[in-house]
Interface confidence: medium
């Protein structure tokens, strides 16, 4: 099994970043860390989407990675998509330093995110609490600012 992965985030605008993934044991948590720049200040939805297809830009990555057919939620929630990593927070300079540890995603097995697309969104993810149908699907996080396919790293 792969123990490390990497993703280069790019979009049509100024948003770009590099995100690293590491999983020391097959059933253990995945550390996710890196930096994204070019964002507006505040929170931005951060998700793994189903397909590793960026042929038409980030839109072709499909919906959130959701092999268990659950409703959208936050990373701390029982009811969540596998790909629901919550939000990243950008500072006044537009930089979001990402530091996550998640026990639902994996670098192997049924919840493997390798070959899928990581997306950073225009708006905050409401973590499924927005009170409308879109909240239970996307968290009302808005458009896809930048994305990249998650690949195996050395």
């Amino acid at each position: 099994m792969a123990t490390k992965a990497v993703c280069v985030l790019k979009g049509d605008g100024p948003v770009q970043g590099i995100i690293n993934f590491e999983q020391k044991e097959s059933n253990g948590p995945v550390k996710v860390w890196g930096s994204i720049k070019g964002l507006t200040e505040g929170l931005h939805g951060f998700h793994v989407h189903e397909f590793g297809d960026n042929t038409a830009g980030c839109t072709s990555a499909g919906p959130h990675f959701n092999p268990l057919s659950r409703k959208h939620g936050g990373p701390k929630d029982e009811e969540r998509h596998v790909g629901d990593l919550g939000n990243v927070t950008a500072d006044k300079d537009g930089v979001a330093d990402v530091s996550i540890e998640d026990s639902v995603i994996s670098l192997s097995g049924d919840h493997c995110i390798i070959g899928r697309t990581l997306v950073v969104h225009e708006k905050a993810d409401d973590l499924g609490k927005g009170g409308n149908e879109e909240s239970t699907k996307t968290g009302n996080a808005g458009s896809r600012l930048a994305c990249g396919v998650i690949g195996i790293a050395q």
């Epitope: 948590p29 550390k31 860390w33 890196g34 930096s35 200040e41 505040g42 929170l43 936050g74 990373p75 701390k76 990593l85 919550g86 939000n87 990243v88 927070t89 500072d91 006044k92 330093d97 990402v98 530091s99 996550i100 540890e101 998640d102 905050a124 409401d126 973590l127 609490k129």
Partner: antibody
Framework: QVQLVQSGAEVKKPGSSVKVSCKAS????????ISWVRQAPGQGLEWMGR????????NYAQKFQGRVTITADKSTSTAYMELSSLRSEDTAVYYC??????????????WGQGTLVTVSS | DIQMTQSPSSLSASVGDRVTITCRAS??????LAWYQQKPEKAPKSLIY???SLQSGVPSRFSGSGSGTDFTLTISSLQPEDFATYYC?????????FGQGTKLEIK
């Protein structure tokens, strides 16, 4: 079981510096955001800044910019907060804090016991 | 910076009372609000995050609501151990800011 253990009380002269430590146990130190919050006697809570040890990146409140430096030593799972050019108004209890989940909850779920820094001539 | 204003600053109540503390943000913060309880000479304790999600281990008599700029913390039936100071905190953007606190005292 997560624990944040801070260094002991300090008495400092105006104009000097103080460095407070916060040793973490339980969980993966490098990936968790560590924040520093202070509380002057009889006053409210004030966020000073934070560090992500795995990246070494920091964010500081504008009020403390240039006077505060937050660092982390991953080998000892210890975060540090150094405040320079101390004045009497810096007399406070200084806390380190971290979330229970590193997934950008941005809240402070675990706290150190606090370190009283007294600035007096 | 986002200013957080709590009211009241202090409050006297009796065991069994229902108590509400409000917190107002100077600009919209969606639901990115936490509540803390602090007892004298102790570190604060996390009660609620995301405006309404109860931190694990916190009794269900505590609840939070609100979004945008107006938020409330409600204690449905005060217990002797609830007499403390309560703070709200926004984490919508840096710098994270706290309300000035509400001291809850025994009547």
């Amino acid at each position: 079981q997560v624990q944040l253990v801070q260094s002991g009380a300090e008495v400092k002269k105006p104009g000097s510096s103080v460095k407070v430590s916060c040793k973490a146990s339980g969980g993966s130190f490098s990936i968790y955001v560590i924040s520093w919050v202070r509380q002057a006697p009889g006053q409210g809570l004030e966020w000073m800044g934070r560090i992500i040890p795995i990246l070494g990146t920091t964010n500081y409140a504008q009020k403390f910019q240039g006077r505060v430096t937050i660092t982390a030593d991953k080998s000892t799972s210890t975060a540090y907060m150094e405040l320079s050019s101390l004045r009497s108004e810096d007399t406070a209890v200084y806390y380190c804090a971290r979330p229970d989940s590193p997934n950008h909850s941005n809240t402070f779920d675990y706290w150190g016991q606090g370190t009283l820094v007294t600035v007096s001539s | 910076d986002i200013q957080m204003t709590q009211s009241p600053s202090s409050l006297s109540a009796s065991v069994g009372d229902r108590v509400t503390i409000t917190c107002r943000a100077s600009q919209g913060i969606s639901s990115w609000l936490a509540w803390y309880q602090q007892k004298p000479e102790k570190a604060p304790k996390s009660l609620i995050y995301g405006a309404s999600s109860l931190q694990s281990g916190v009794p269900s008599r505590f609840s939070g609501s609100g979004s945008g700029t107006d938020f409330t913390l409600t204690i449905s039936s005060l217990q002797p151990e609830d007499f403390a100071t309560y703070y709200c905190q926004q984490y919508n953007s840096y710098p994270y800011t706290f309300g000035q606190g509400t001291k809850l005292e025994i009547k």
